[in-house]
Interface confidence: low
């Protein structure tokens, strides 16, 4: 038997993926566990195998369909269960009635690129990935720039309170290497959270012209 507290957290990417993490304080040795998804009003259901991500936590992705297919709506409720093998049976370890559009976490923005770079500024664009058409323009973004000698955690956050898939970074230092990241969040959903940060985009500002002050 498994003792200890259990935490089961899932997010919907707004299209065809539910990602889950299950944490269990207590011994769970070589046990096969799965997440089962049972929508209340749909003909499909899905299962994924939980894989260890740390000593006491497991994760998996429920792939509901092709990446851009709209598999759930704001009125759906999906019963999510953690099932673990105990001998010849499966034991239910955790359960939640999951409201997908109250628990959103989008995919990280993709296709980051430098549109234009100068000595002190850089214009960067990106695209959102696998985001539902239901959001229309109801999205916000956070961005951060990594300067030399600093960490990502020290980088100040820039907030874009609208669906704006570009930013113009100002007051940069000439001839300097920077990295840039962006993340996205729908305005909808009580438990909605930020997407993961995008892959960093590295860029370098242009050097100052010779004989000019910087």
């Amino acid at each position: 038997a498994v003792n200890g507290t259990s935490r089961f957290t899932c997010f919907y990417n707004s299209r065809a993926n539910i990602s889950c993490v299950w944490s269990q304080d207590g011994a769970l040795q070589d046990t096969s566990c799965q997440v089962h998804a049972w929508p209340d009003r749909r003909r499909w259901n899905q299962t994924c195998e939980l894989l260890p991500v740390s000593q006491a936590s497991w994760a998996c992705n429920l792939i509901l369909g092709t990446p851009d297919s709209q598999k759930l709506t704001a009125v759906d409720i999906v019963t999510l269960r953690v099932m673990c093998r105990e001998g010849v049976r499966w034991r239910m370890m955790a359960i939640q009635d999951f409201k997908p559009f109250e628990n959103l976490r989008l995919m990280a923005p993709i296709s980051l690129q430098v549109v234009h770079v100068e000595t002190h500024r850089c214009n960067i664009s990106w695209k959102i990935s696998q985001a539902s058409h239901y959001f229309e323009r109801h999205l916000e973004f956070e961005a951060r720039t990594l300067s030399p000698g600093h960490t990502w955690e020290e980088a100040p956050l820039m907030t874009l309170k609208q669906k704006q898939e570009w930013i113009c970074l100002e007051t940069l230092t000439p001839d300097t290497q920077y990295e840039f990241q962006v993340r996205v969040k729908p305005l909808q959903g009580e438990f909605t959270t930020w997407s993961p940060w995008s892959q960093p985009l590295a860029f370098r500002t242009k050097p100052a012209a010779l004989g000019k002050d910087t």
């Epitope: 003909r43 299962t47 010849v88 049976r89 499966w90 239910m92």
Partner: antibody, heavy 119, light 106 residues
């Protein structure tokens, strides 16, 4: 509606092999285990094995050396292959599925397919 | 393997009678299932997890028991209940069934 449809039964020579299909509809074999159970004429039920949703299998130890259960997720079909058949393997072969969980027992059964092992 | 022994192997009762079938396991089992099989048909699940009625099953059917001793009851036998009844354990591989109890109408 959940349905299971077996096919592939018939007359098989002793020493020969048998390949049965179980076509599933109304659910996905990637979400449920599918079991095979047989019943010899006038006899009781005998559990042979199962293929789970993830593709792993459990077999009755009495048959493990000559039994293979597999599946094709794209066809939503489970396959049952038994080798070295003998007269006592003559039976109606059923595929079955548990309810939402194993705890629910064999809630869904196919109609069965008769296999006769005889020369 | 866990041996499941049903008794009686057959019985004859009148319509309206209370019918009881027992299933004895050779070792303790956690959960027991009961199936009905009419001639020429696939088995039908009646009782799961010892005492729970499967979907669409009339309430005259019931199950009880624990450990190695389990009981299946038809509170008022009906003509459509003519069938063979099987118990089954789902605690240890291989899953095993009782040999069956054939129920007939007098």
């Amino acid at each position: 509606e959940v349905q299971l449809l077996e096919s592939g039964g018939g007359l098989v020579q002793p020493g020969g092999s048998l390949r049965l299909s179980c076509a599933a509809s109304g659910f996905s074999v990637t979400s449920y285990g599918v079991h095979w159970i047989r019943q010899a004429p006038g006899k009781g039920l005998e559990w042979l094995g199962v293929i789970w949703s993830g593709g792993s299998t459990d077999y009755n130890a009495a048959f493990i050396s000559r039994l293979t259960i597999s599946k094709d997720n794209s066809k939503n079909t489970v396959y049952f292959q038994m080798n070295s058949l003998r007269a006592e393997d003559t039976a109606v072969y059923y595929c079955a599925r548990a309810g939402d969980y194993n705890y629910d027992g064999f809630a869904y059964w196919g109609q069965g397919t008769l296999v006769t092992v005889s020369s | 393997d866990i041996q499941m022994t049903q008794s009686p192997s057959s019985l004859s009762a009148s319509v309206g009678d209370r019918v009881t079938i027992t299933c004895q396991a050779s070792q303790s089992v956690s959960f027991l299932y009961w199936y009905q099989q009419r001639p020429g048909k696939a088995p039908r699940l009646l009782i799961y997890d010892t005492s729970n009625l499967a979907s669409g099953v009339p309430s005259r059917f019931s199950g009880s028991g624990s450990g190695t001793s389990y009981t299946f009851t038809i509170s008022s036998l009906q003509p459509e209940d003519i069938a063979t009844y099987y118990c089954q354990q789902w605690s240890t591989y291989p899953l095993t069934f009782g040999q069956g109890t054939k129920v007939e109408i007098k």
